[in-house]
Amino acid sequence: LPAQVAFTPYAPEPGSTCRLREYYDQTAQMCCSKCSPGQHAKVFCTKTSDTVCDSCEDSTYTQLWNWVPECLSCGSRCSSDQVETQACTREQNRICTCRPGWYCALSKQEGCRLCAPLRKCRPGFGVARPGTETSDVVCKPCAPGTFSNTTSSTDICRPHQICNVVAIPGNASMDAVCTSTSPTRSMAPGAVHLPQPVSTRSQHTQPTPEPSTAPSTSFLLPMGPSPPAEGSTGD
């Protein structure tokens, strides 16, 4: 004969556990129903009555089958340097991610705790490794024969144009100036962007251009190269 199906609440057999989507209530000493995502336990079960579930209120949620007395509060609204990539619903928490031009400097279980602006490489420096959602830009000094005359989080060092006759030699922050009307070979006039991320770890110590990364400092006057602002918290 098939085993009899037990309906909640029921007393489990000694040594056995409750079934999926059930929990053992210590007070009632019975297996009772869990509440579905988006709900919480309004009334706990007894020996004779099962769990009574109720929907989560606005701005609260439960993501899992549960028997919590209150739903969890959704996180606070996303800060100005963040965008809401997942709204707060009865079944899921709000998720905030950093807006374009920023990266997550300190993550949390879901979303980002601290966003910071991507570093802008100053003239003479180009992007060695582009920023990602979770990592800052890495800058490097432009090597001989290359230059960058921009303050940018995307521009790399570009080769100097090659002149028939050089009027002013190029350096790390300035292109060469030709005397003739057109150079022998000139790079595209637009800023060049770094396509792919470079290797994950670098340990340069030679006197060649090197990358690096860091944020803003309130220590300097506003005239300064202004590293990223402190960033903000999105809890």
Partner: antibody, heavy 121, light 107 residues
């Protein structure tokens, strides 16, 4: 208030190892690049090592490359310097410094009080 | 490595006098230079960055200038608190070397 507090210095024999730590507070640690700088008994300053804010890029002076390792724990707001195969010329005051925000803001804007490392037999 | 040659190594002056300390880089460092002040038993403190910009809180009697690969720190009307050791440092390619220091003593 920005604070950098070094610890872990001491007396060690040549060839030995030492681990320095720097506890940081008062700023968004995970967004700043950090370095170690040392000052010899003769008062010369020498940049030792650098690590970027995410811990991805590290640079070393030739004098310590292969012997020293700079790391950071952004969850603990702590910077580290693991020193091995120590030589007598590594004897110095070691400073934890904030910066440079390399390629963007190139300077050391805050320095710790320093921790003394003495390598001697 | 880029060599930073700082001069003079030391000098002794009266309060109220003006002093200029120089640092010459062995190659172009594109204004990526900082000046620090260190007092006896203390850590260095940032004075000037980008060769000419004063760090916050630094008195206006301090000024930085550059000419080619030569960088200067000028202190007008020396005050008693200005005495100490001054260092320059470049931030072009690694290693980021310091000058040998200039010890400024009170006469």
């Amino acid at each position: 208030e920005v604070q950098l507090q070094e610890s872990g210095g001491g007396l060690v024999q040549p060839g030995g190892s030492l681990n320095l730590s720097c506890a940081a507070s008062g700023f968004a640690f995970s967004t700043y690049d950090l370095s170690w700088v040392r000052q010899t008994p003769g008062k010369r300053l020498e940049w030792v090592a650098y690590i970027n804010n995410g811990g991805i890029s590290t640079y070393y002076s030739d004098t310590v490359k292969g012997r020293f390792t700079i790391t950071r724990d952004n969850a603990k707001n702590t910077l580290y310097l693991q020193m091995s195969s120590l030589k007598s010329e590594d004897t110095a005051m070691y400073y934890c410094v904030r910066g440079p925000f390399y390629g963007s803001a190139n300077y050391f804007d805050y320095w710790g009080q320093g921790t003394t490392v003495t390598v001697s037999s | 490595d880029i060599l930073m040659t700082q001069s003079p190594a030391s000098l002794s002056l009266f309060v109220g006098e003006t002093v200029t300390i120089t640092c010459r880089a062995s190659e172009n460092i594109y204004s990526n230079l900082a000046w620090y002040q260190q007092k006896q038993g203390k850590s260095p403190q940032l004075l000037v960055y980008d060769a000419t910009k004063l760090a916050e809180g630094v008195p206006s009697r301090f000024s930085g200038s550059e000419s080619g690969t030569q960088y200067s720190l000028k202190i007008n009307s020396l005050q008693s608190e200005d005495f100490g050791t001054y260092y320059c440092q470049h931030f072009w390619v690694t290693p980021w070397t310091f000058g040998g220091g200039t010890k400024l003593e009170i006469k």
